[in-house]
């Protein structure tokens, strides 16, 4: 169809914030549980702790994280899992200071990337019971389709 | 012409992953020379330790390099050179802990620039022989022009 | 109006560098006054310690704030006022060294969010007389109309 | 305290060429790179260009690559600049200066006493 | 490169007066400038850094301000000691540049 000026820039976007975040008992890593704060499109789904790609595409991604965490790195993976494999796309780390009055670091990346119909994405910190702060303007994960 | 659904979203995209780096042994800095990971649209050319705009226009850029190294400061400097002159769009800085073992830090950041055609996009480190990780999820460079 | 090749990809965009910055004596923060060093589209108008929203939308927002500072943790918040309330967006933190040679760090964060006309966006460092580095590369805000 | 003592006064021919040396004592010699500031008599300051002792890099100012050669020594904490295929106009107080290690964004804190070169035929 | 200019090259003022010194970037500059006395035959000494920053022991009566591309320094009473030469330097990019210099003396 003919583009109207308003259709034009109708770029489908997902900014989510955290629910909660848990460790699995049996793996060294934490996972968020995301909730959409802001929404246009209906190609993005979120789905427990993860995001479900409806409609395949270019997409920028970013992500960030709060720790106030004493472990000497943290950081985060972001990661799609489809079609039988997993793929790490990018990660973000942070060195963290030893007292834990100072260990107050946001860890933010991002880049642009081809997913797939039916694609999870996720956000994992590779560490068991990591101390993150869940704060929305904090902790957040977000999808623009180019 | 009239746009298609499908016209209307192709930003032309790159994103670049690192083959390796380098120090010139007269200049106190460390080159990377990138290759495409994902690219869409032709204006933008990979080529050795730069990126050629074959296409000017607007863009976001972003550059993420993941230091392993005591060095008290780390960073990146993203420039373009064209016209006879470089200039600096942007760069990151990180401080580095002086533990080998707590010396690892992602540093990222982007910006929307105007680039012209012909320009040659680089990212130095201004480090003689630099530590980095050249894993293609936490050192990367990318552009979408908007 | 149907939209041409050219049309389609005018995303309005404004990058901006600092003019300078100060702390109110009354008050522990410290504000950036800004500049345009890259302006496309008439949505968005800087004005003093502020952004005004002069087209509603969906914005793609960044920040870096470049720190010289040995205050135990330093970072940035952007936030939006109107309609009579004050909304904080995203923030960035970063933990410092204690040692004023070492104390150097960039803190970069981004989002996407719906911004209202009338709005005024702004770049606060909960810190009075925080030690900023106030170079365009290094300190800068920006914003992409999606 | 912060010390930095270069070497004595020099006088050279024309195409020779002049190596000042720069003794740093009082501070972590490889925490901070050496920057060389020259300043032609009854002129303002130039800057030549820096070495990184941490990794015995040099950054040089484009107008000086190819003549100018910057070394360190860390056993010894001491920078060395050469000038080679010296000239009248090379005539000048040359100093040494020490800055932060990311060089850029940081101020000279610290100067050395200034060598004298003289080249005169 | 990026050009410094200052004004005046000379200054002539009085024990007690307060005067200031300009400098202007050919380009935006940030805050990253840095003010140095010189005394003939002695090496410059640093007074300001990051645009208004006073390096430690340097008198309170020397101030620095600007950013971007216009800065000053101002005495804001002169004593006999600060009758010297006053050079500007930005270091924001490289080459590091320096303005011409601005000679203080006596009237």
């Known amino acids: 169809a003919v583009l109207t000026q308003k259709q034009k820039k109708q770029h489908s976007v997902l900014h989510l914030v955290p629910i909660n975040a848990t460790s699995k008992d049996d793996s060294d890593v934490t996972e968020v549980m995301w909730q959409p704060a802001l929404r246009r499109g209906r190609g993005l789904q979120a789905q427990g702790y993860g995001v479900r790609i409806q409609d395949a595409g270019v997409y920028l991604l970013y992500s960030q994280v709060l720790f106030q965490d004493v472990t000497f790195t943290m950081g985060q993976v972001v990661s799609r899992e489809g079609q039988g494999r997993q793929e790490t796309l990018f990660r973000c780390i942070r060195s963290m200071p030893s007292h834990p009055d100072r260990a107050y670091n946001s860890c933010y990346s991002a880049g642009v990337f081809h997913l797939h119909q039916g694609d999870i994405l996720s956000v994992i910190i590779p560490r068991a019971r990591a101390k993150l702060n869940l704060s929305p303007h904090g902790t957040f994960l977000g999808f623009v389709k180019l | 012409a009239v746009l298609t659904q499908k016209q209307k979203k192709q930003h032309s995209v790159l994103h670049l992953v690192p083959i390796n780096a380098t120090s010139k042994d007269d200049s106190d800095v460390t080159e990377v020379m990138w290759q495409p990971a994902l690219r869409r649209g032709r204006g933008l050319q990979a080529q050795g330790y730069g990126v050629r705009i074959q296409d000017a226009g607007v863009y976001l850029l972003y550059s993420q390099v993941l230091f392993q190294d005591v060095t008290f400061t780390m960073g990146q400097v993203v420039s373009r050179e064209g016209q006879g002159r470089q200039e600096t769009l942007f760069r990151c800085i990180r401080s580095m802990p002086s533990h080998p073992d707590r010396a690892y830090n992602s540093c990222y950041s982007a910006g929307v620039f105007h680039l012209h055609q012909g320009d040659i996009l680089s990212v130095i480190i201004p480090r003689a022989r630099a530590k980095l990780n050249l894993s293609p999820h936490g050192t990367f460079l990318g552009f979408v022009k908007l | 109006a149907v939209l041409t090749q050219k049309q389609k990809k005018q995303h309005s965009v404004l990058h901006l560098v600092p003019i300078n910055a100060t702390s109110k004596d009354d008050s522990d923060v410290t504000e950036v006054m800004w500049q345009p060093a890259l302006r496309r589209g008439r949505g968005l108008q800087a004005q003093g310690y502020g952004v005004r929203i002069q087209d509603a939308g969906v914005y793609l927002l960044y920040s870096q704030v470049l720190f010289q500072d040995v205050t135990f943790t330093m970072g940035q918040v952007v936030s939006r006022e109107g309609q009579g309330r004050q909304e904080t967006l995203f923030r960035c933190i970063r933990s410092m060294p204690s040692h004023p040679d070492r104390a150097y760090n960039s803190c970069y964060s981004a989002g996407v969010f719906h911004l209202h006309q009338g709005d005024i966006l702004s770049v606060i460092i909960p810190r009075a007389r925080a030690k900023l580095n106030l170079s365009p590369h290094g300190t800068f805000l920006g914003f992409v109309k999606l | 305290q912060v010390q930095l003592v270069q070497s004595g006064a020099e006088v050279k021919k024309p195409g020779a060429s002049v190596k000042v040396s720069c003794k740093a004592s009082?501070?972590?010699?490889?925490?901070?790179?050496m920057h060389w500031v020259r300043q032609a008599p009854g002129q303002g300051l130039e800057w030549m260009g820096y070495?990184?002792?941490?990794?015995?890099?040099?950054k040089y100012n484009e107008k000086f690559k190819g003549r100018v050669t910057m070394t360190s020594d860390k056993s010894a904490s001491t920078a060395y600049m050469e000038l080679s295929s010296l000239r009248s106009d090379d005539t000048a107080v040359y100093y040494c200066?020490?800055?932060?290690?990311?060089?850029?964004?940081?101020?000279?804190?610290?100067w050395g006493q200034g060598t004298t070169v003289t080249v005169s035929s | 490169d990026i050009v410094m200019t200052q004004s005046p090259s000379t200054l002539s003022a009085s024990v007690g007066d307060r005067v200031t010194i300009t400098c202007k970037a050919s380009q935006n500059v940030g805050n990253n400038v840095a003010w140095y006395q010189q005394k003939p035959g002695k090496a410059p000494k640093l007074l300001i850094s990051s645009a208004s920053n006073r390096d430690s022991g340097v008198p309170s009566r020397f101030s620095g301000s600007g950013s971007g591309t216009e800065f000053t320094l101002t005495i804001s009473s002169l004593q006999p000691d600060d009758f010297a030469t006053y050079f500007c330097q930005q270091y924001n990019i490289y080459p590091f540049t320096f303005g011409q210099g601005t000679k203080l003396e006596i009237k």
């Open positions: 070495i990184n002792p941490y990794n015995d890099a040099p």
């Open positions: 009082g501070y972590t010699f490889t925490s901070y790179v």
């Open positions: 200066a020490r800055g932060l290690g990311y060089a850029l964004y940081y101020a000279m804190d610290y």
